[in-house]
């Protein structure tokens, strides 16, 4: 892959260990936690990133859902099981044999059960709504400028194809970025919207996953865009299966 040959590092993932032990002495990088080889020319999958971050503190949230089927990552961090391609395994279990099913971004989509719980397939998250609230500014941002700035960011920094940024909505102080990517739309080599959203979330929080690239200073026409709250909603191709008890709680 294209890890920097000079110092053998992974530009797209700082949570790696790299050494020149690949074919022909090429730099090869492996994700912490899993030891899996990663492609440093693109984003690392969220599953491998979460696995590398397993020792980080829990980051629980309780959010309002924009629709009855939208999921929010209320469970926070956990040590996931990833498949050989680095994707989340459909069934995740903790060390006390409590199991649950997750979607392609690793968010729980069923009630928790025991080892007998079956998760037949990894259900794809095809629609992600990133809901941001920015700090007060002298005036509202120009919607067109804001739209262009965010689309450019996702294209240049996260290498997400522009067609997957469905819309950018703005009603001061709330910005909503809609990412959409059906299974049929995602070609080989395309960045996954779940991975792009995760890198963006970490950038916004000042926790960049990139190696030696510095952070992100968001601006629109010279005006700093400082995010004070981030909520992310996930919609799956197949609605989640929770008991009525949870839905009415």
């Amino acid at each position: 892959h294209t890890a920097a040959q000079d110092n053998c590092t992974c530009p797209t993932n700082k949570m790696t260990v790299c050494s020149p032990d690949g074919p022909g002495g090429r730099c090869q990088c492996r994700a912490l936690g899993s030891g899996m080889a990663v492609d440093c020319s693109t984003l690392t999958s969220k599953c491998l990133l979460l696995k590398a971050r397993m020792s980080a503190p829990k980051n629980a949230r309780t959010l309002v859902r924009p629709s009855e089927h939208a999921l929010v990552d209320n469970d926070g961090l956990y040590d996931p099981d990833c498949d050989p391609e680095g994707r989340f395994k459909a069934r995740q279990c903790n060390q006390t044999s409590v199991c649950w099913c997750v979607n392609s971004v690793g968010v729980r989509r069923t009630d928790k059960g025991d080892l007998s719980l079956r998760c037949d397939e990894l259900v794809r998250t095809h629609h992600i709504l990133i809901d941001l609230r920015h700090r007060p500014t002298a005036g509202a941002f120009n919607h067109s400028d804001l739209d262009a700035e965010l689309r450019r960011l996702f294209r240049e920094r996260y290498r997400l194809h522009p067609k997957f940024v469905a819309a950018v909505h703005y009603e001061q102080p709330t910005i909503q970025i809609e990412l959409r990517q059906n299974t049929s739309q995602k070609a080989a080599g395309d960045v996954d919207i779940g991975d792009a959203a995760y890198y963006f979330e970490r950038d916004i929080k000042g926790e960049s996953l990139f190696q030696g690239r510095g952070g992100l200073d968001l601006r629109v026409r010279g005006e700093p865009l400082q995010v004070e709250r981030t909520l992310i909603y996930y919609l799956d191709e197949i609605p989640p299966k929770f008991s009525m008890k949870r839905l009415t709680a």
Epitope: E149, R152, R157, G214, G215, D217
Partner: nanobody
Framework: QVQLLESGGGLVQPGGSLRLSCAAS????????MGWFRQAPGKEREFVSA????????TYADSVKGRFTISRDNSKNTLYLQMNSLRAEDTAVYYC??????????????????????WGQGTLVTVSS
């Protein structure tokens, strides 16, 4: 309209140091992200270093990391590049560039030539014994 004027180039021995300056005029300097690029004889122009409006988040090409330091003085409308431990392969014409769009600053944007809308005429740096 922005005018950029580089200075400080010259002949230096390997291991030596130089400090390049870029004086900007014509628009509010503090609202621009700035960069240094270079072009060696017979080669493409390449990114060297960049810095945001505030002076935070400096970015460097791998080939100059630890040797070059970018800085800016907004009160003097001037961008600097301190070059230490110079090598023969650092020989090039060094260009100062400004991004006046007021857009975001991040590595992928700062390192791309197409992000910059104003360029200086360049100053020649020759590293030779």
């Amino acid at each position: 309209q922005v005018q950029l004027l580089e200075s400080g180039g010259g002949l230096v021995q390997p291991g030596g140091s130089l400090r390049l300056s870029c004086a900007a005029s014509g628009r509010t300097f503090s609202s621009q992200s700035m960069g240094w690029f270079r072009q060696a004889p017979g080669k493409e122009r390449e990114f060297v270093s960049a810095i945001s409006w505030t002076g935070a988040n400096p970015t460097y090409a791998d080939s100059v990391k630890g040797r070059f330091t970018i800085s800016r003085d907004n009160s003097k409308n001037t961008l600097y590049l301190q070059m230490n431990s110079l090598r023969a392969e650092d020989t090039a014409v060094y260009y100062c560039a400004a991004d006046t769009s007021g857009g975001s600053y991040y590595y992928e944007r700062a390192t791309a030539e197409t992000s910059y809308d104003y360029w200086g005429q360049g100053t020649l740096v020759t590293v030779s014994s």
